[in-house]
């Protein structure tokens, strides 16, 4: 049974040319996080954070994305095209997969950055990779 909840930075805005931190947090479960995938609105992957192997930033974003803080992601040199949805997908054992959503609006004007922290509905599915279960350590 999946008992966890994903908290995210929710709806955020940031200035064009600036930076923003995308952050998700999994709570209310003892499940071990094995991998976190960060995806953009068009389902293109930005980065992977594997609990055992570390970070991988996808080449298309290598100059604009920095890993962290924590399991989060820092998106730099923002453009108007960065406006849209971002998803964090937590692969866990034994729970399965949790997914969080963040909406980023990139603003032309100098509107102050703000963020709202709130809980969102989760999407889950059973974990099927039994061979993974012996290899995970919690980060």
């Amino acid at each position: 049974m999946m008992t966890g909840t994903i908290e995210t930075t929710g709806n955020i805005s940031a200035k064009k040319g600036g930076s923003v931190i995308l952050q998700c947090h999994l709570s209310s479960t003892m499940a071990q996080v094995t991998q976190v995938n960060w995806e953009q609105h068009d389902h293109s992957l930005l980065a992977i954070r594997n609990a055992e192997l570390g970070w991988h930033i996808y080449p298309a974003f290598k100059d604009r994305v920095a890993p962290g803080p924590g399991l989060g992601l820092t998106l730099q040199s923002l453009t108007m095209n960065d406006t849209g949805e971002y998803f964090c997908t937590y692969h866990t054992y034994p729970d399965g997969t949790y997914r969080g959503r963040i909406f980023l609006e990139v603003l032309e004007s100098s509107v102050a950055e703000h963020s709202a922290r709130f809980q969102i509905p989760i999407e889950g599915r059973d974990y099927k990779d039994d061979d993974d279960k012996h290899h995970h350590h919690h980060h």
Epitope: I48, N50, E52, L53, G54, W55, K62, D129
Partner: antibody, heavy 121, light 106 residues
Framework: EVQLVESGGGLVKPGGSLRLSCAAS????????MSWVRQAPGKGLEWVGR??????????DYAAPVKGRFTISRDDSKNTLYLQMNSLKTEDTAVYYC????????????WGQGTLVTVSS | SYELTQPPSMSVSPGQTASITCSGD??????ACWYQQKPGQSPVLVIY???KRPSGIPERFSGSNSGNTATLTISGTQAMDESDYYC?????????FGGGTKLTVL
């Protein structure tokens, strides 16, 4: 010890089939993106295709010359990568290597010793 | 289809710097990797993700990648560096190798 060991190579007639295996040890195989690379005698390296980890969809990508004829699969419970080769042509003759894709600072750039596939009548 | 171009061969004197180039359309948007291969042996990764060096690879190997060109630089080249060198363009949908450069240490 961290290693990749290929097997299953041999002599096959044009139009025939062969399945190569790559046994991984010493690391968590299920996390790795794995590729097959081949090298024809006296020629350069040629990427054949790859399979992503299940946590990245487990999807496959192939080079144009083998698309539709070759199939890459993995069995994470056996720490094994496979290359099913069908409708083989003489130009498929090569040493076939399995490798880990260079994603992470750990577990990057591992290569097996290779296995020779000869397609000849 | 995507192609990478390398010089087929080049030579360098011991102790000098060798720079092997690899060109491809918008190669800087992908990751460039470099492999060293000696006769009868499996390739060895010497540079990955443009400029990172795997453990065990000497500091004299360095890499860069921007625009349409990736470069492998070997500073203070040694006789043992005589090999074939292959560049590789890597992204999440495809992988391509260059034709290889035979480096001779005179």
């Amino acid at each position: 010890e961290v290693q990749l060991v290929e097997s299953g190579g041999g002599l096959v007639k044009p139009g025939g089939s062969l399945r190569l295996s790559c046994a991984a040890s010493g690391f968590t195989f299920s996390y790795a993106w794995m590729s097959w690379v081949r090298q024809a005698p006296g020629k350069g390296l040629e990427w054949v295709g790859r399979i992503k980890s299940k946590t990245n969809g487990g999807t496959t990508d192939y080079a144009a010359p083998v698309k539709g004829r070759f199939t890459i699969s993995r069995d994470d419970s056996k720490n094994t990568l496979y290359l099913q080769m069908n409708s083989l042509k003489t130009e498929d003759t090569a040493v076939y290597y399995c490798t880990t894709d260079p994603l992470y600072d750990i577990l990057t750039g591992l290569w097996g010793q290779g296995t020779l596939v000869t397609v000849s009548s | 289809s995507y192609e990478l171009t390398q010089p087929p061969s080049m030579s360098v004197s011991p102790g000098q710097t060798a720079s092997i180039t690899c060109s491809g359309d918008k190669l800087g948007d992908k990751y460039a990797c470099w492999y060293q291969q000696k006769p009868g042996q499996s390739p060895v990764l010497v540079i990955y993700q443009d400029s990172k060096r795997p453990s065990g690879i000497p500091e004299r190997f360095s890499g860069s990648n921007s625009g349409n060109t990736a470069t492998l630089t070997i500073s203070g080249t040694q006789a043992m560096d005589e090999s074939d060198y292959y560049c590789q363009a890597w992204d999440s949908s495809t992988v391509v190798f260059g034709g290889g450069t035979k480096l001779t240490v005179l």
